[in-house]
């Protein structure tokens, strides 16, 4: 039994890391791997993490981490019974993939603007929490062509646009997903989307 | 409110022992990394021992090793550190404190401190 | 045992004044850096853990920054009671290490 990938691993910065390997044939992860994972600090405890099955060959550990900060390194060590097949480390504030907003939703009763909102998906304590900015992506469920993304550079999870930039009486579809330049994150996964039907009043013509 | 007491200092023979005590209340002592941090007459501060949550693994500076022993009651919600063949460079004030994470790192509580005299 | 250089040693100043305090590892440390502060008579008190985050309930004009090697400490604008003596302390190399403290006076 030999790794075929070696693991790489990102953190959410909260309290989960995921960790993904590919072994070179056939493995039922949870019975016969086990991946370790220890600060480098003093009397730091040692945890054990039972991998799941992601495709024939592929692993996938989900790692429970409290109150991750900038210094914390971890030594990974993947075992097969009592054989050691990998030894690594990881440095959480250098692989940093941000949680997904949640909660997105589209005011329609602001005069002719749109104002769309979400939760930032970390609490005020965490660090990530005052360093993230958003991009919303709004498109058509009836062109495809229709498809538009808003960089939101600001810290306030909000954007407001004028109904009369999209078209009137279509249905359209907004998702956010977030990331932090402070740790050069990856971006996060996209939240899950929110459906409304555009219809603003056009403005009287002048003749 | 958080607060650890530490008792049990004084003046001591040289060679002699002593035992320092630190209560901890209004937070949960059970979970909690502590650990003895001294500081000398000239100021300087010094990680003494440390110790894990249940007491199964502990740390000490190589200039106490053998002679100090960190231990704790949690039934009791204390924090216990018995020094012997004391030497007159252990003369300092000795804080009780809390590990801010589960491993030696920043200390976010501290005691007031308990002064010990180790003369000839 | 690594080695903790904080300098100056003492520090006059004024009120509203920036202070900035700085520490030297004598090898890599990463960001496992603490800054304490002790007020006369009294014990050390958390400000800063892993380099640059600002404990619970610490005022914003503290702030501290750095990695690897070199440290820094800032105050923006000092006030009163921010008489005392500042303490750096390294966890990343056994044993752990203090720097000899920065006493900041105010003229």
């Known amino acids: 039994m030999k790794v075929l990938q070696e693991p790489t691993c990102v953190s959410d910065y909260m309290s989960i890391s995921t960790c993904e390997w590919k072994m070179n044939g056939p493995t039922n992860c949870s019975t016969e791997l086990r991946l370790l994972y220890q600060l480098v600090f003093l009397l730091s405890e040692a945890h054990t993490c039972i991998p799941e099955n992601n495709g024939g060959a592929g692993c996938v550990c989900h790692l429970l981490m409290d109150d991750v900060v900038s210094a914390d390194n971890y030594t990974l060590d993947l075992w097969a019974g009592q054989q050691l097949l990998w030894k690594g480390s990881f440095k959480p504030s250098e692989h940093v993939k941000p949680r997904a907003p949640g909660n997105l939703t589209v005011h329609t009763n602001v005069s002719d603007t749109l104002l769309l909102t979400w939760s930032n998906p970390y609490p005020p304590d965490n660090y990530l929490y005052n360093h993230l900015t958003y991009a919303v992506n709004i498109w058509s469920e009836n062109d495809p062509a229709d498809f538009r993304i808003y960089n939101v550079t600001y810290l306030e999870p909000s954007l407001r646009i004028a109904a009369s930039t999209l078209k009137s009486g279509i249905s359209y579809r907004a998702r956010v997903r977030a990331w932090a330049q402070c740790y050069n994150t990856t971006w996060s996964e996209w939240s899950p989307s929110t459906k409304w039907h555009n219809s603003y009043r056009e403005p009287f013509e002048q003749h | 409110d958080v607060q650890l007491v530490e008792s049990g200092g004084g003046l001591v023979q040289l060679g002699g022992s002593l035992r320092l005590s630190c209560a901890a209340s209004?937070?949960?002592?059970?979970?909690?990394?502590m650990s003895w941090v001294r500081q000398t007459p000239e100021k300087r501060l010094e990680l003494v021992a440390a110790i894990n949550s249940n007491g199964g693994k502990t740390y000490y500076a190589d200039s106490v090793k053998g002679r100090f022993t960190i231990s704790r009651d949690n039934s009791k919600n204390t924090l216990y550190l018995q020094m012997s063949s004391l030497r007159a460079e252990d003369t300092a004030v000795y804080y009780c404190?809390?590990?801010?994470?589960?491993?030696?790192?920043?200390?976010?509580?501290w005691g007031q401190g308990t002064s010990v005299t180790v003369s000839s | 045992d690594i080695q903790m250089t904080q300098s100056p040693s003492s520090l006059s100043t004024s009120v509203g004044d920036r202070v900035t305090i700085t520490c030297k590892a004598s090898?890599?440390?990463?960001?496992?850096v603490v800054w304490y502060q002790q007020k006369p008579g009294k014990s050390p008190k958390l400000l800063i853990y892993?380099?640059?985050y600002r404990y619970t309930g610490v005022p914003s004009r503290f702030s501290g920054s750095g990695s690897g090697t070199d440290f820094t400490f800032t105050i923006s604008s000092v006030q009163p009671e921010d008489i005392a003596t500042y303490y750096c302390h390294q966890y990343y190399g056994s044993p752990p290490t203090f720097g000899g403290g920065t006493k900041l006076e105010i003229k």
């Open positions: 090898q890599d440390v990463s960001t496992a």
């Open positions: 892993s380099a640059s």
């Open positions: 209004g937070f949960t002592f059970s979970s909690s990394y």
């Open positions: 404190t809390r590990q801010r994470g589960n491993y030696v790192g920043a200390m976010d509580y």
